[in-house]
């Protein structure tokens, strides 16, 4: 009787107890594969969840979130609220980041901003509690003449960084020193 | 919304063939055994033939075995039952239904008379 | 060959009474009993699975009990749009069979 059940395909359960074994799974039940004993009550999308897919005689149903939740585990066995960026989700409800901390997404956790210092590089864009900062080129790239890797720091609002304006008010200061030595220079030879 | 809409029915003489259809919408009919069910007029509802989601299992009612074949066309979400060597007991409304016996189409009659 | 006989062939109720009728299976179908209703020129609806298992939209007048060899449906309180025939119909095993049917007609 083993070999009869299966026979039984999917749609149907398997009855060793009779000579004819298959029968048809009832309305909202299932069995997705030929020779099971019993067949599974289909999920029920209620509540948080809506459904994806309908329940079938040979398959289960499958769920989403509504709108303002989104799915937890395996074949979204959860829904939990949606915060909004900036936010992680508390036993009280959404809460904003913590200074140091950001969330780019609807879910999970507020994480640390990177910190650049332990790579070696700068801030070249603060964080905020939406995004993470930006690391920059390390200071030393930034002496004169040090050729580069890092890619040009694209365009960006006012707001620089310490590093950017030191070297600029360095490259500022020995710019005018070479002017300055360069008319005096002049100077000495129109006197001779 | 599921809908199932027999058709093919008509008057056939005693010994010809006739093919019944049914076109199946509204849900995922590859997902789905099927059934043809029979109503003799003022009569009960008697089970012809039932065909497994992928086509490879079918069982017959005693009655028909040998002379009616069950098939199915998933991708045209329809339906078959090809029936041979009509005797006028065949006579009766022809539905359809999924195989949870939940949903059933609206039915088309054959009459096998001379 | 499983055979589902019901009971009583036909009835006539007033709006609003109690309405039971009775299927025997002619051996154990455990709960795989299903009640369907026929209107006159129409298909079967699903009224009850499982024996007792109200399908979707089903108004809870419809109660379906019993299970092994005995099935009853009930009607608590029988509106006019139930004139109709209702069979009950075996799924436990190949061949499927129905009841012959009882058909409920209004005093």
């Known amino acids: 009787l083993q070999d009869l059940c299966s026979n039984c395909p999917a749609g149907t359960f398997c009855d060793n107890n009779r000579s004819q074994i298959c029968s048809p799974c009832p309305p909202n039940s299932f069995s997705s594969a030929g020779g099971q004993r019993t067949c599974d009550i289909c999920r029920q999308c209620k509540g948080v969840f809506k459904t994806r897919k309908e329940c079938s005689s040979t398959s289960n149903a499958e769920c989403d979130c509504i709108s303002g939740y989104h799915c937890l585990g395996a074949e979204c066995s959860m829904c939990e609220q949606d915060c909004k960026q900036g936010q992680e989700l508390t036993k009280k409800g959404c809460k904003d980041c913590c200074f140091g901390t950001f969330n780019d997404q609807k879910r999970g956790i507020c994480r640390p901003w990177t910190n650049c210092s332990l790579d070696g590089k700068s801030v070249l864009v603060n964080g905020t509690k939406e995004r993470d900062v930006v690391c920059g080129p390390s200071p030393a790239d930034l002496s004169p003449g040090a050729s580069s890797a890092t890619p040009p720091a694209p365009a960006r609002e006012p707001g620089h960084s310490p590093q950017i304006i030191f070297f600029l008010a360095l490259t500022s200061t020995v710019v005018l020193f070479l002017l300055f030595f360069l008319v005096l220079d002049y100077k000495d030879d129109d006197d001779k | 919304e599921v809908q199932l809409v027999e058709s093919g029915g008509g008057l056939v003489k005693p010994g010809g063939s006739r093919k019944l259809s049914c076109a199946a919408s509204g849900f995922t009919f590859s997902e789905f055994g099927m059934h043809w069910v029979r109503q003799a007029p003022d009569k009960g509802l008697k089970w012809v033939a039932y065909?497994?989601?992928?086509?490879?299992?079918?069982y017959y009612a005693d009655t028909v075995k040998g002379r009616f074949t069950i098939s199915r066309d998933n991708a045209k979400n329809t339906l078959f039952l090809q029936m041979t060597s009509l005797r006028s007991e065949d006579t009766a409304m022809y539905y359809c239904?999924?195989?949870?016996?939940?949903?059933w189409g609206q039915g088309t009659t054959l009459t096998v008379s001379s | 060959n499983i055979v589902m006989t019901q009971s009583p062939k036909s009835m006539s109720m007033s709006v609003g009474e109690r309405v039971t009728l009775s299927c025997k299976a002619s051996?154990?179908?455990?709960?795989?009993v299903s009640w369907y209703q026929q209107k006159p020129e129409k298909s079967p609806k699903l009224l009850i699975y499982g024996a007792s298992n109200r399908y979707t939209g089903v108004p809870d007048r419809f109660t379906g009990s019993g299970s092994a060899t005995d099935f009853t449906l009930t009607i608590s309180s029988v509106q006019a749009e139930d004139l109709a025939d209702y069979h009950c119909g075996q799924s436990y095993s190949y061949p499927l069979t129905f009841g012959a049917g009882t058909k409920l007609e209004l005093k």
């Open positions: 239904a999924r195989d949870w016996v939940d949903y």
């Open positions: 051996e154990n179908v455990g709960s795989y």
């Open positions: 065909i497994s989601s992928g086509g490879s299992t079918i």
